[in-house]
Interface confidence: low
């Protein structure tokens, strides 16, 4: 806590400007009016305050807004955002995507902090769903964001948002998450033609059921082995040798290199040897 002391004569701040960097902590506390600070928050970032001075400014805002800052202040917090605790952020009601972007920009290039996680959580809950613009923004700053959500949270993602997802945004998703995302992707891309559809759906196929894989095998898609290896084992097991051959096209020869790994290993064990022999790869069931 900063002690309450009277402002020295002539030092009362009329505006938030560069001169304040020479104020001691107690002078900032005594001479800067919290309401003035709130209306001129956009100037704070342009002034090279020390972290200690920023603590004082935060303290003043906390006193002025004990129930949580208004969005007009939040949007201009800039580096002061790094001073906020998750508890502070839980009091906020952030509704503007521009506000979210402004605060994510401050944290850009760093790992997702508890503060950022809380901010995103508040924002998404306030919107009721993870819409396309929000997802676009979040994955731009944090490509792994989507895979940090629980399957329950992912269920609130509307199919239209899937268009914002890039392959690397799914790098760290586990099968349970892909189980939720795949049907949404299927719906989102349903009006695309065969080859375009496959390009878009490919990253989500770790959540595809057997019947969809069978359908893809009829479309001459030439799935690569990396994609095949990420398919659900339970979805691959019922596929026939002929279906896998059609699904993989020229990549079918890659099965030999993967014969000891799931799901290839388990699939081989389910096949009749004379069917496997038709591939000419020396696979042993």
């Amino acid at each position: 806590e900063v002690e309450k002391t009277a402002c020295p004569s002539g030092k009362k701040a009329r505006e938030i400007d560069e001169s304040l960097i020479f104020y001691k902590k107690w002078e900032l506390e005594a001479c800067v009016d919290a309401a003035l600070l709130a209306t001129q928050m956009d100037r704070v970032n342009a002034i090279p305050f020390t972290y200690e001075q920023l603590d004082v400014l935060k303290h003043k805002l906390d006193e002025l807004y004990p129930q949580g800052y208004p969005e007009s202040v939040i949007q201009h917090l800039g580096y002061l955002f790094l001073k906020m605790s998750p508890e502070d952020i839980r009091k906020w009601n952030v509704t503007s995507l521009e506000t979210l972007k402004a605060l994510l920009e401050v944290n850009k290039g760093h790992e997702m902090s508890p503060q950022v996680a809380t901010l995103i959580d508040r924002f998404v809950k306030g919107r009721g769903q993870l819409d396309k613009d929000t997802l676009d923004t979040l994955t731009a700053f944090y490509p792994g964001y989507l895979c940090s959500l629980s399957p329950e949270e992912l269920s609130s993602v509307p199919p239209s948002s899937i268009w914002a997802v890039r392959p690397q945004d799914l790098d760290t998703c586990d099968p349970r998450q892909l189980d939720v995302l795949y049907p949404k992707a299927r719906l989102a891309f349903q009006n695309m033609n065969g080859s375009e559809y496959f390009v878009k759906i490919q990253s989500f196929l770790g959540g595809a059921p057997t019947e969809d894989l069978k359908a893809l095998s009829q479309q001459n898609v030439s799935m690569d082995l990396a994609t095949f290896m990420k398919l659900r084992t339970d979805a691959v097991l019922p596929l026939t040798v002929a279906e896998v051959q059609k699904l993989l096209g020229p990549h079918v020869e890659g099965l030999k290199a993967e014969e000891r790994h799931r799901p290839v290993r388990d699939w081989i064990l389910r096949q009749r040897q004379d069917d496997l022999d038709t591939l000419g790869l020396g696979l042993q069931g």
Epitope: N107, K108, G109, H110, E111, M112, A140, F141, Y142, P143, G144, R166, P167, Q168, L170, D171, T172, D174, A226, K230
Partner: antibody, heavy 119, light 107 residues
Framework: EVQLLESGGGLVQPGGSLRLSCAAS????????MTWVRQAPGKGLEWVSG????????YYAASVKGRFTISRDNSKNTLYLQMNSLRAEDTAVYYC????????????WGQGTLVTVSS | DIQMTQSPSSLSASVGDRVTITCRSS??????LAWYQQKPEKAPQSLIY???SLQSGVPSRFSGSGSGTDFTLTISNLQPEDFATYYC?????????FGGGTKVEIK
């Protein structure tokens, strides 16, 4: 300070194998996707392989697929590249690089280790 | 695969010059483009990510612009330490691909 230190390079005959390692320090290794990039003598940069945070998802350039295997041990803060069936055209300096937290580009690189494939 | 084409492949310039390097992708990549600087016998260093965002610690004389298929790296006031090779790289989709490089030499 983030540091990535590659090792395991050397001279190997065509058809031989090598295992490269990349020891990471100064970062929460398990939080970042990692990658290998190579540079043949006097040539440009070529992306070789990438691996997700958990190690569960891997990507390969067509030129190495089926011969190279990327892996990671998060408990040892180490990234690996197992190179089999090596060819003369695999001769290069191999760099490991860390993917930025907020982006897919590579913000930190190791100093590189030279792999020479020759008989 | 997405092809990245850099031009010119080399250029000569003097200290204080403004240098512009372009990078074109064979298909749209949004803003998912990075620029790297590499000096002889050294590892590459990140300069720009997301087409225009400056990597921490990189001097402000470096700037990036563009989106879609056409991108530019500009060095506004060339310094002696800037003579190096510059590479662009797309990370919109796998396989990740680099441009062929642009060597900036002393005139």
């Amino acid at each position: 300070e983030v540091q990535l230190l590659e090792s395991g390079g050397g001279l190997v005959q065509p058809g031989g194998s090598l295992r490269l390692s990349c020891a990471a320090s100064g970062l929460t290794f398990r939080s970042y996707a990692m990658t290998w990039v190579r540079q043949a003598p006097g040539k440009g940069l070529e992306w070789v392989s990438g691996i997700s945070v958990s190690g569960g998802i891997t990507y390969y350039a067509a030129s190495v697929k089926g011969r190279f295997t990327i892996s990671r041990d998060n408990s040892k803060n180490t990234l690996y590249l197992q190179m089999n069936s090596l060819r003369a055209e695999d001769t290069a300096v191999y760099y490991c690089a860390k993917r930025g937290a907020a982006v897919g580009s590579f913000d930190y690189w190791g100093q590189g280790t030279l792999v020479t494939v020759s008989s | 695969d997405i092809q990245m084409t850099q031009s010119p492949s080399s250029l000569s310039a003097s200290v204080g010059d403004r240098v512009t390097i372009t990078c074109r992708s064979s298909q749209g990549i949004g803003s998912w483009l990075a620029w790297y600087q590499q000096k002889p016998e050294k590892a590459p260093q990140s300069l720009i990510y997301a087409a225009s965002s400056l990597q921490s610690g990189v001097p402000s004389r470096f700037s990036g612009s563009g989106s879609g298929t056409d991108f530019t790296l500009t060095i506004s006031n060339l310094q002696p330490e800037d003579f190096a090779t510059y590479y662009c790289q797309q990370y919109n989709s796998y396989p990740l691909t680099f441009g062929g490089g642009t060597k900036v030499e002393i005139k």
